[in-house]
C-alpha cells in the first residue's frame, strides 16, 4: 500500500506543488525540529521496576544511520527489596518510526522509506493468568 | 525504488552522506504493521504504571494518526491495587521521524520531521536527595 493521497474535499492541490515522477515522491531529509530539547526524567532505564539496557544499531545505508533499541534486563520486575519478582513481567514498549533506506543496484542508487519498530523501554505488568478448565 | 544514476566514476565515488533531497518510492517497506497500540497489546491497562492513549490526528503528516500515552497516576499501582505515591509513574518518550507535507497539501512532496511522543509509562523509584 502507498501513502494516501490528499484527495479529500477540504484539500485542493496547490499550484506550487513540485512535479514528481509517477510512483515516487520528493522527500527533503533536512529534519524539521532537528534540535528540539528532550526533557525526559533522569536515568529512568535504571530506576524503573522493569529496567532496560540500550543498544545502538548502526547502518550507513539507513537515514538516520543510528537507531537505539532498548532490551528489558529481566523477565520479572524489581521489587522494593531490589530483588527480581517473577510473579510480575517486564515487557517491552514499542513504537514505529520511519527511516530512509539507500539501496545500491550496480552503479545506481535508489531510496526507499521503511517503517522500523523501535523498543523504547520496558514496563512492569501483571501477567495474564489462564485458568485451566 | 526510483534509481538515480551515480557519477561517471561510480566505483570510486561512494558518497557516505545522504543527499538533502531524495526521490523515494511511494511504497513503504513494512507498512502494514499494526499502528494501533490498543489492538497490539493491553500493556497500557496491565502495567503497574498504566496509561491512557490519546489519538493525535494531522492530515498534513504521515502517519496521520499517532497515539500519545498519558500516565493515569502520579504513583504506581501496588499489589493491593492501590496507588502508591512512594513510587512514580513516568512517561517513556521517544523521538520519531514522520513525513510532513511540504509545501502544505501537496500529495507527493514531504519533509522529514522529528517529533517527541510518549509511548507508554514505566514505574520508577524516586530520586531521593539525602541531606548531608
Amino acid at each position: 500500500r502507498k501513502i494516501p493521497k490528499v484527495g479529500h474535499t477540504f484539500f485542493q492541490k496547490p499550484e506550487s506543488c513540485p512535479p514528481v515522477p509517477g510512483g515516487s515522491m520528493k522527500l527533503d531529509i533536512g529534519i524539521i525540529n532537528e534540535n528540539q530539547r528532550v526533557s525526559m526524567s533522569r536515568n529512568i532505564e535504571s530506576r524503573s521496576t522493569s529496567p532496560w539496557n540500550y543498544t545502538v544499531t548502526w547502518d550507513p545505508n539507513r537515514y538516520p544511520s543510528e537507531v537505539v533499541q532498548a532490551q528489558c534486563r529481566n523477565l520479572g520486575c524489581i521489587n522494593a527489596q531490589g530483588k527480581e519478582d517473577i510473579s510480575m513481567n517486564s515487557v517491552p514498549i514499542q513504537q514505529e518510526t520511519l527511516v530512509v533506506r539507500r539501496k545500491h543496484q550496480g552503479c545506481s542508487v535508489s531510496f526507499q522509506l521503511e517503517k522500523v519498530l523501535v523498543t523504547v523501554g520496558c514496563t512492569c505488568v501483571t501477567p495474564v493468568i489462564h485458568h485451566v478448565q | 525504488g526510483i534509481t538515480i544514476p551515480r557519477n561517471p566514476g561510480c566505483p570510486n565515488s561512494e558518497d557516505k552522506n545522504f543527499p538533502r533531497t531524495v526521490m523515494v518510492n511511494l511504497n513503504i517497506h513494512n507498512r502494514n504493521t499494526n499502528t494501533n497500540p490498543k489492538r497490539s497489546s493491553d500493556y497500557y491497562n496491565r502495567s503497574t504504571s498504566p496509561w491512557n492513549l490519546h489519538r493525535n490526528e494531522d492530515p498534513e503528516r504521515y502517519p496521520s494518526v499517532i497515539w500519545e500515552a498519558k500516565c493515569r497516576h502520579l504513583g504506581c499501582i501496588n499489589a493491593d491495587g492501590n496507588v502508591d505515591y512512594h513510587m512514580n509513574s513516568v512517561p517513556i518518550q521517544q523521538e520519531i521521524l514522520v513525513l510532513r507535507r511540504e509545501p502544505p497539501h501537496c500529495p507527493n512532496s514531504f519533509r522529514l520531521e522529528k517529533i517527541l511522543v510518549s509511548v507508554g509509562c514505566t514505574c520508577v523509584t524516586p530520586i531521593v536527595h539525602h541531606v548531608a
Epitope: 526524567s41 529512568i44 | 530520586i127
Partner: nanobody
Framework: ESGGGSVQAGGSLRLSCAAS????????MGWVRQAPGKEREGVVS????????YYADSVKGRFTIAQDNAKNTMYLQMNSLKPEDTAMYYC?????????????????WGQGTQVTVSS
C-alpha cells in the same frame, strides 16, 4: 506548607511552601492536590530555574504560581475558589513536567495543607 484553611466560595487563599535546597535542584516545583476519595493530581507547576508554568484546565485563570528563589519558597495564589477545590494541597518537587504536562517523577513531598471551600 502553610496558608491552608476554610473559606467561602469565591474567596481567596495563598499557600506557601518553603522547600529544602535539594527540592530546588529538581527541574520543577508545583502543587498537587488530593480531594477526599480521589487521586492526587498535579494542578500547577513551575520550572525551578525559571521558565514554563503549567496550570490544569480546572484552575486556569484562578490560580497563580510564583517562586522566590532567594528564599527557596514557592507560592500559590488561589482566587475565586470553588467547593470542588476542597482538597489536601501538597507542595511537590520533581524531575518531569512542562507547560503542557503536569509535574511528575516527584522526589519531594511536603506534609500537605488542607483547603476547604464551602458553598
Amino acid at each position: 506548607e502553610s496558608g491552608g484553611g476554610s473559606v467561602q466560595a469565591g474567596g481567596s487563599l495563598r499557600l506557601s511552601c518553603a522547600a529544602s535546597e535539594y527540592a530546588w535542584r529538581l527541574n520543577r516545583m508545583g502543587w498537587v492536590r488530593q480531594a477526599p476519595g480521589k487521586e492526587r493530581e498535579g494542578v500547577v507547576s513551575i520550572g525551578t530555574r525559571g521558565g514554563s508554568t503549567y496550570y490544569a484546565d480546572s484552575v486556569k485563570g484562578r490560580f497563580t504560581i510564583a517562586q522566590d528563589n532567594a528564599k527557596n519558597t514557592m507560592y500559590l495564589q488561589m482566587n475565586s475558589l470553588k467547593p470542588e477545590d476542597t482538597a489536601m494541597y501538597y507542595c511537590a518537587a520533581g524531575l518531569g513536567g512542562d507547560s503542557r504536562t503536569p509535574i511528575y517523577d516527584i522526589s519531594y513531598w511536603g506534609q500537605g495543607t488542607q483547603v476547604t471551600v464551602s458553598s
